[in-house]
């Protein structure tokens, strides 16, 4: 009896694992083995595929074959018993294009109200991702074990800290990798669970803010208790993006070591231009808090986030406000190439009742005003990056009278 060729060959590539699966074309024939050949682009000859010769099952692994993952290859398979079937050719493919990103490795550490997640590629020193290893980003899904309500967090790096959790609570999460440069989304890791600890006696400092005074930075924070000492550390923000780096060498700010107030002042020249992360820790001599949430600190924005400049066009029932770039001392506009959000406060000149508008646009309408009434307006800018959380001071107030009631255009 003639052997039929195997059919429906599937090639699965996850990281550096190359797996072939196929269907037997004739289940009634026993003791059949299967063998594969491969052919590289531009070659005429077929080569036996090591790891996939005389296979009795319908699956084989050819990961040991050292292929150029960017080069197209072709496979063929046949069945063998006393005689052999004809070859069945599989559509040619490029391993890199076909490859999926495998599940990453996940390592968890718990605090009372936070979890630290260390993520690394599932395959160490992968050949498949050798040129892309630095481009991995990760996303995760986290939920309380008791509720199952999922929260997604996108675009994180190899170390991520989730804050504002509940003490003594089990959280579960799974992580997957992505290579956005190649439009590849990976496979989720197994689910990992960890229980946060009992609540710490000392909470971490909160509401950390940086401002500029003269040639100094002033770092302020809030704390629940008195008679504490604090220390502040910094880290280059770009280190967070380094996928191989699971050791963050946080550095002390010398003028902010063992300070007894909820602020510290240090010279601007402590930091070169760049983006940094800052964190604060409290101690009462016996106990120490966990570190505060890390805040992002951009020396450029810090120095130059000036209040917005605006013009008002008055109508009978509204103001049109046109926001322009702030001016430096030489009356030249400051170019701010990061997205800002504007907070506009306005009030009737004779009243203290303030109203607020938050707007991303630079032309804003303040509606529902009374005709022939003096209103005052002030504005400030905020960065839109929640981690930077930087605000300018308010501009000086500008007061204008609305037009009489018949001019609404």
């Amino acid at each position: 009896k003639n052997l039929k060729s195997p059919q429906k060959v599937e090639v699965d590539i996850i990281d550096d694992n190359f797996i072939l699966r196929w269907n037997r074309s004739d289940e009634s024939v026993g003791n059949v083995t299967f063998s594969f050949d491969y052919q590289k682009t531009g070659m005429d000859n077929w080569i036996k595929l090591s790891g996939c010769q005389n296979i009795t099952s319908t699956k084989c692994n050819f990961s040991s074959l050292k292929l150029n993952v960017y080069e197209e290859i072709k496979l063929r398979i046949r069945a063998e018993k006393e005689n052999t079937s004809s070859w069945y050719e599989v559509d040619s493919f490029t391993p890199f294009r076909k490859a999926q990103i495998g599940p990453p490795e996940v390592h968890l550490e718990a605090e009372d109200k936070a979890i630290v997640i260390h993520i690394s590629p599932g395959t160490k020193d992968s050949v498949m991702w050798a040129l892309d290893g630095l481009s991995f980003t990760y996303s995760l899904v986290i939920w309380k074990n008791s509720s199952g309500v999922e929260e997604r967090i996108e675009n994180i790096y190899s170390r991520h800290k989730i804050y504002k959790l509940s003490p003594e609570t089990t959280y579960c999460l799974k992580v997957k990798a992505a290579l956005l440069t190649s439009w590849k989304i990976g496979v989720y890791s197994p689910v990992h669970c960890i229980k946060t600890t009992v609540e710490n006696e000392l909470p971490p400092p909160e509401n950390i803010e940086v401002s500029v005074q003269n040639q100094n930075y002033v770092l302020k924070w809030d704390y629940t208790y008195a008679n504490m000492t604090f220390q502040v550390q910094w880290l280059h923000a770009f280190l967070k993006r380094n996928p191989g780096n699971h050791l963050y060498k946080w550095k002390q700010i010398p003028d902010c070591e063992n300070v007894k107030t909820t602020q510290c002042v240090f010279p601007q020249n402590v930091f070169q231009k760049g983006i940094y992360l800052l964190r604060v820790q409290a101690s009462d001599g016996n106990n120490t808090s966990f570190w505060s949430e890390e805040i992002k600190f951009d020396t450029e924005i810090q120095a130059f986030l000036l209040p917005p400049v605006f013009n008002i066009r008055s109508l009978s029932d509204s103001f049109h406000i046109y926001i322009g770039a702030p001016k430096q001392s030489g009356n030249t506009p400051v170019i701010q190439d990061y997205p800002l959000i504007y907070e506009i406060i306005f009030w009737e000149n004779t009243s203290n009742a303030e109203r607020k508008i938050i707007e991303k646009k630079t032309d804003v309408t303040v509606p529902n005003l009374k005709p022939l009434t003096v209103y005052c307006v002030k504005a400030r800018a905020h960065t839109m990056d929640e981690k930077l959380n930087k605000s300018s001071v308010f501009s000086d107030a500008v007061c204008e009278k609305t037009k009489p009631g018949n001019t609404s255009k």
């Epitope: 968890l108 009372d112 600890t197 780096n245 699971h246 050791l247 106990n287």
Partner: antibody, heavy 117, light 107 residues
Framework: EVQLQQSGAELVKPGASVKLSCSAS????????IHWVKQRTEQGLEWIGR????????KYAPKFQAKATITADTSSNTAYLQLNSLTSEDTAVYYC???????????WGQGSTLTVS | DIVMTQSQKSMSTSLGDRVTVTCKAS??????VAWYQLKPGQSPKTLIY???YRSSGVPDRFTGSGSGTDFTLTISNVQSEDLAEYFC?????????FGSGTKLEIR
């Protein structure tokens, strides 16, 4: 292969100083911290301090602040522990260990025996 | 400074038994605790890090657990090569602190 090779046994007189070395291979010490740990006979392990070889920043246990000085030479991929004003209390085995990630002390040196007599 | 208390200086066990070594931190250190095995004339060996993660090459009869202030190292099916001293260590804050050690002996 990651290895931390420590200098050999030392016999020194009280009051003298000694400098122990820890030579790393298979990784770059600039990517890690190098820690030093003391172990006295029939006593436990005591953390002496650590260095960030990248910039020389050090941290010490209060007890060893005046006793120990940790340095590093990145060109030879080596860390050093200098102990001064030696007394019999300093007789111990001294280990270096690396800390490159969340695994903490994942590799240790074989230990250097210091005898003060 | 944080104190890591290993209340049992030594423990007696029989081969094949299950034994639990405990360690108590004087304040909450999260899960930033490691366990080390020390045999005479040898370098310390890292068994457990981050309270519950086994170091590579460590047999799965060694298990770490705990968080906050209370930590345990469990050795199930004790083997003769497990006779050693075991130290816990916190590395959440400086200075790094080791426990005083627990010696495992065979009955």
């Amino acid at each position: 292969e990651v290895q931390l090779q420590q200098s050999g046994a030392e016999l020194v007189k009280p009051g003298a100083s000694v400098k122990l070395s820890c030579s790393a291979s298979g990784f770059n010490i600039k990517d890690c911290y190098i820690h030093w740990v003391k172990q006295r006979t029939e006593q436990g392990l005591e953390w002496i301090g650590r260095i960030d070889p990248e910039d020389g920043e050090t941290k010490y246990a209060p007890k060893f602040q005046a006793k120990a000085t940790i340095t590093a030479d990145t060109s030879s991929n080596t860390a050093y522990l200098q102990l001064n004003s030696l007394t019999s209390e300093d007789t111990a085995v001294y280990y270096c260990a690396r800390h490159c990630n969340f695994l903490y002390f994942d590799y240790w040196g074989q230990g250097s025996t210091l005898t003060v007599s | 400074d944080i104190v890591m208390t290993q209340s049992q200086k030594s423990m007696s066990t029989s081969l094949g038994d299950r034994v639990t070594v405990t360690c108590k931190a004087s304040q909450n250190v999260g899960t930033i605790v490691a366990w080390y095995q020390l045999k005479p004339g040898q370098s310390p060996k890292t068994l457990i890090y981050s309270a519950s993660y086994r170091s590579s090459g460590v047999p799965d009869r060694f298990t770490g657990s705990g968080s906050g202030t209370d930590f345990t190292l469990t050795i199930s099916n004790v083997q003769s090569e497990d006779l050693a001293e075991y130290f816990c260590q916190q590395y959440n804050n400086y200075p790094v602190i080791f426990g005083s050690g627990t010696k495992l002996e065979i009955r």
